[in-house]
């Protein structure tokens, strides 16, 4: 994804352990725009800065995720960090986008591969086929070899997902296409869930 995600991650990584805890607690009670769902408490409290950034972007997308992070940081009295995000927001042109209403009245979710990260890590068995489909177009040679070096399917998928935060939508779509080819019934099962 883009600059907004990186800015959110930078801000969260600048928080102390206690501040990150406080950030999560405030995230559980902050007023959300109509049409957006809340990150489940149980999952939220376990997350480190990277996981939380991914979750913010997948639940709220970059524009609103950035705005929400700013709101919580201001509420915590961390004005300087919030201002840094404000600068990113203005530079990326996210202001106009964030001001619009969400498309449906149901809770917003992220890309399919973000939503089903845990299930995909647990249930994808033909990882090499997926890797071959992504090799060159999405994964560099080094990334491809790093994933293949892992011993179990789960470890391979976990390693593959460590690269996902830097991917744009077309990269995530490429992974989804590969999964639809190699694990169609898994994708259909997850779609129903």
């Amino acid at each position: 994804m883009g600059r907004a995600r990186d800015a959110i991650l930078d801000a969260l990584e600048n928080l102390s352990g206690d501040e990150l805890k406080k950030f999560k607690m405030k995230l559980l009670t902050v007023q959300l725009r109509e049409g957006y769902g809340r990150i489940p408490r149980g999952a939220l409290l376990q997350m480190d800065a990277i996981d939380l950034t991914d979750k913010l972007v997948s639940y709220y997308l970059e524009s609103y995720g950035l705005e929400l992070t700013m709101t919580v940081l201001r509420d915590m009295g961390l004005q300087e960090l919030a201002e840094q995000l404000q600068t990113t927001k203005e530079e990326s042109g996210a202001v106009a986008a964030a001001a619009s209403v969400p498309a449906q009245s149901t809770a917003r979710t992220g890309h399919f591969v973000d939503q089903h990260r845990q299930a995909l890590i647990a249930r994808v068995t033909e990882v090499d086929g997926v890797l071959d489909a992504l090799h060159g177009s999405v994964l560099t040679e080094g990334q491809y070899q790093a994933v293949r070096a892992e011993t179990t399917s789960q470890d391979k998928m976990r390693k593959l997902f460590s690269f996902v935060p830097s991917w744009n939508l077309t990269c995530k779509d490429s992974l989804l296409q590969a999964l639809k080819e190699i694990h169609p019934y898994l994708v259909m099962d997850l779609e129903q869930s």
């Epitope: 994804m1 883009g2 997308l61 970059e62 524009s63 609103y64 996210a94 106009a96 986008a97 964030a98 001001a99 619009s100 209403v101 969400p102 498309a103 449906q104 917003r108 979710t109 992220g110 890309h111 399919f112 973000d114 939503q115 744009n168 939508l169 077309t170 990269c171 779509d173 989804l176 296409q177 639809k180 080819e181 169609p184 994708v187 259909m188 997850l190 779609e191």
Partner: antibody, heavy 122, light 107 residues
């Protein structure tokens, strides 16, 4: 409600280029990809590609790679398709369209622009 | 690219009839298939997604079935407003491809 408003019909000469616009309302442009379709008279629909304004990435049908360039301007909530080196084969109705939901395992197009008729003639 | 073959290319039926349009994919597309209706001079309208799911606001006289490579769109109790061209579209893989269309007319 979600709306996609396309620019008016264009009449251009062979060899020229054209930029068709698709202004969205009722949702944030960065929340969904915008896909483009081509329809020639008495022919079916062809998928040109999509652009995701949320991160600027695009995916093209190989048949239209080099012919079409997809962009977006977030500040005006507008997606664009630039078509170059136009010939009579490019004369068609072009539609912008948006998948109905984000996060599904595949796309189904529930929202369409009204179409822009492009005529390439000398 | 996945080829989508639709048949018949045109169809004439009487009011009240039940008609069936078929779509055949050149390879397995599971259930990733959509059906659209396009009335003359109008934009395509989504009818069915995921092979059999009726899109919001679409009349229950439309139904879809099939998986893998063979799919059907059925219109029961044909009405005057059902005239138009019907297209199938696969969403299994890029580039997305459409069937050639079935033009439906009323006798």
């Amino acid at each position: 409600q979600v709306q996609l408003q396309q620019s008016d019909a264009e009449l251009v000469k062979p060899g020229a280029s054209v930029k068709i616009s698709c202004k969205v309302s009722g949702y944030a442009l960065t929340d969904h990809s915008i896909h483009w379709m081509k329809q020639r008279p008495e022919q079916g629909l062809a998928w040109i590609g999509y652009m995701y304004p949320g991160d600027g990435s695009a995916n093209y049908n190989d048949k239209f790679r080099g012919k079409a360039t997809l962009t977006a301007d977030i500040s005006s909530s507008t997606a664009y398709m630039h078509l170059n080196s136009l010939t009579s084969e490019d004369s068609a109705v072009y539609f912008c369209t948006r998948p109905y939901s984000f996060g599904s395992s595949y796309d189904y197009f529930g929202y369409w622009g009204q179409g822009t008729t492009l005529t390439v003639s000398s | 690219d996945i080829q989508m073959n639709q048949s018949p290319s045109s169809l004439s039926a009487s009011l009240g009839d039940t008609i069936t349009i078929t779509c055949h994919a050149s390879q397995n597309i599971n259930v990733w298939l959509n059906w659209y209706q396009q009335k003359p001079g109008n934009i395509p309208k989504l009818l069915i997604y995921k092979a059999s799911k009726l899109h919001t606001g679409v009349s229950s006289s439309f139904s879809g079935s099939g998986s893998g490579t063979g799919f059907t769109l059925t219109i029961s109790s044909l009405q005057p407003e059902d005239i138009g061209t019907y297209y199938c579209q696969q969403g299994q893989s890029y580039p997305y491809t459409f069937g050639g269309g079935t033009k439906l007319e009323i006798k």
